[in-house]
Interface confidence: low
């Protein structure tokens, strides 16, 4: 095991120093400091840096002191052998100062040993005539990354334009583990894809699902130690079905009497996708109609023929009205007015022999 | 119900140590993110700084380094220390849980203690 | 540090009104920004997280939005409850920062 060490002069006492008097140790430190001429207390121009041991790697601790006669460090109230410290030392040209800066390595074992509530830390402690300075405290934790997310996204079916929220608390972690989103297998940018939001507690949001959204997410958490992935959530953005607008109404399909007249639409506005509903409702319309029957045109009889004229002619007559045609019925087809010679009356001149005159009516 | 409450005295000597205390009830404190935010009287919040219970802190830079915020699991409280105080430093100071990691929102307050910097 | 620049500093409003209150943040900080509710005497009290977000328990009348660099809290109609101070805070990066606040006061 490492030895511990504590110095046994009352100017470099602490409150937490604890541990077994080391000679090896303490005649490094000095019972006394020149005391001219005067010089300030260290200062610490590199502190130690909290740091983390993964897997088996030990973690290198480091600081820099100046002025500094002596440096070392304490971890966990007890000196840090001197046989464990890598010192150097130069003399700072501007200031004529000696700078110490000193290093030490901490295994996993050394912090797996500790025993109690607190975490392991180191602090460096740095000598001048003037007196003693001690840095923060570094603390030393060994990262992990547990394997089981805390909560996991799950698959969801939505509409389109809905807002969409999929969980994920990554696993225990230290250091706690950062989250990303992949959208299939790419890295979700919301810098770069407004819609997509990702909240301070990991949880991803979609603000309005797009016909692209579909797609499988997965949350990713990773520190220095790991990264996993939870498992992935699929995500179907469907779309409802909604109608087109109605057709025009038909013609009515009778020629003659009672039918009907219909008009359509389709589940077209849009069509259903992914699953989505198809549109509820009547898809055709229909409603009564007459048509008129045509009535076709029909002869009256003729009348009586009329008296011979003076042209030695006489006619006769008929009208279209036996019924008249109506509602797109056919007209009737023939002579209205019938003319023939005769020879019963004085003539103003003589009938030719010829063929009856016909005068059509239209 | 998450309940968090301040304690701590209410006068500290210019120079000296502030140290208040937040017990948390009703939650455990092993998730969230534990932080403490004062308001100088008649004036606005300002963030101090936030520890995991993991270890992980964050301060405020303007107070970097006179604070150190520190969590103790076993008693489900929080602490802060806030050192060579002065009059600036006079303010209701509030205990919150924040929701999720590094930035995140404060969803449950102490009622806040006012401490007063004086000799 | 990022600045939040809140407007108005004060108002006057009456029950029934609708109140607009902006948040104007010195960069870019997506949609991570937060609103509170603060009565004299006591802590803040969290309305909307994440720009948009409303905090389980808080009446649906108050709604935020933006992106970017500003934002807006919208009260639809001011109830006498509401009379407060209200905080806009980034949470895009440390240190987390407040905007001044807006004064809702009784016309």
């Known amino acids: 095991g490492s030895h511990h060490h504590h110095h046994h002069g009352s100017d470099y006492k602490d409150d937490d120093d604890k541990g077994s008097q080391d000679d090896e140790f303490f005649h490094e430190l000095p019972e006394t400091f020149p005391s001219d001429p005067p010089e300030p207390l260290p200062h610490f121009l590199i502190e130690p840096e909290e740091a983390y041991i993964v897997k088996n790697k030990p973690v290198n601790l480091y600081c820099k002191a100046s002025p500094a006669t002596q440096i070392y460090f304490k971890c966990n109230s007890e000196w840090v052998h001197q046989k464990d410290h890598v010192v150097d030392e130069r003399v700072d040209e501007t200031s004529g100062l000696i700078v110490r800066e000193v290093s030490i390595e901490i295994s996993r074992q050394q912090v797996e040993e500790l025993f109690g509530p607190e975490d392991y830390w180191c602090q460096c402690v740095a000598w001048s005539s003037a007196g003693t300075t001690k840095s923060r405290k570094a603390y030393v934790r060994i990262a992990y990354l547990r394997k089981t997310f805390e909560q996991e996204p799950l698959g969801k079916e939505v509409s389109l334009e809905q807002e969409v929220l999929l969980q994920c608390r990554p696993p225990e972690g230290i250091p706690v583990a950062e989250v990303e989103w992949l959208k299939n297998e790419d890295i979700i940018d919301p810098a770069e894809d407004r819609n997509f939001y990702i909240t301070i507690d990991h949880n991803l949001i979609i603000k309005q699902a797009r016909l692209s959204d579909t797609a499988n997410y997965t949350c990713v958490a990773k520190n220095i130690v790991a990264k996993r992935k939870s498992t992935t959530a699929t995500v179907i953005v469907y779309v409802n079905g909604g109608w087109s607008t109605w057709t025009e109404w038909s013609v009515c399909n009778s020629r003659c009497g009672r039918g009907y007249q219909k008009r359509t639409r389709t589940c077209t506005n849009p069509a259903p996708l992914n699953g989505g509903a198809f549109c509820e409702g009547q898809s055709v319309q229909k409603i009564a109609c007459t048509t008129l029957c045509p009535v076709d045109g029909r002869w009256t009889s003729w009348s009586k023929w009329s008296t011979c004229g003076t042209e030695c002619t006489h006619w006769r007559r008929r009208e279209c009205t036996a019924p008249a045609p109506k509602n797109g019925g056919k007209d009737c087809d023939g002579l209205v007015l019938q003319s023939k010679n005769c020879t019963d009356g004085l003539c103003m001149q003589a009938a030719p022999d010829s063929d009856d005159v016909a005068l059509y009516g239209s | 119900q998450v309940q968090l409450q301040e304690s701590g005295p209410g006068l500290v000597k210019p120079s000296e140590t502030l140290s208040l205390t937040c017990t948390v009830s009703g939650g455990s404190i092993s998730s969230y993110f534990w932080t403490w935010i004062r308001q100088p009287p008649g004036k606005g919040l300002e963030w101090i700084g936030y520890i995991h219970n993991s270890g992980t802190t964050n301060y405020n830079p303007s107070l970097k380094s006179r604070v150190t915020i520190s969590v103790d699991t076993s008693k489900n409280q929080f602490s802060l220390k806030l050192s060579s105080v002065t009059a600036a430093d006079t303010a209701v100071y509030y205990c919150a849980r924040g929701r999720g990691m590094a930035t995140l929102p404060f969803d449950y307050w102490g009622q806040g203690t006012l401490v007063t910097v004086s000799s | 540090d990022i600045q939040m620049t809140q407007s108005p500093s004060s108002l006057s409003a009456s029950v029934g009104d609708r109140v607009t209150i902006t948040c104007r943040a010195s960069?870019?900080?997506?949609?991570?920004l937060n609103w509170y509710q603060q009565k004299p005497g006591k802590a803040p009290k969290l309305l909307i997280y994440?720009?948009?977000s409303l905090q389980s328990g808080v009446p649906s009348r108050f709604s935020g939005s933006g992106s970017g660099t500003d934002f807006t809290l919208t009260i639809s109609s001011l109830q006498p409850e509401d009379f407060a101070t209200y905080y806009c805070q980034q949470s895009y990066s440390t240190p987390l920062t407040f905007g001044g606040g807006t004064k809702v006061e009784i016309k």
């Open positions: 960069q870019s900080i997506s949609s991570y």
């Open positions: 994440a720009a948009s």
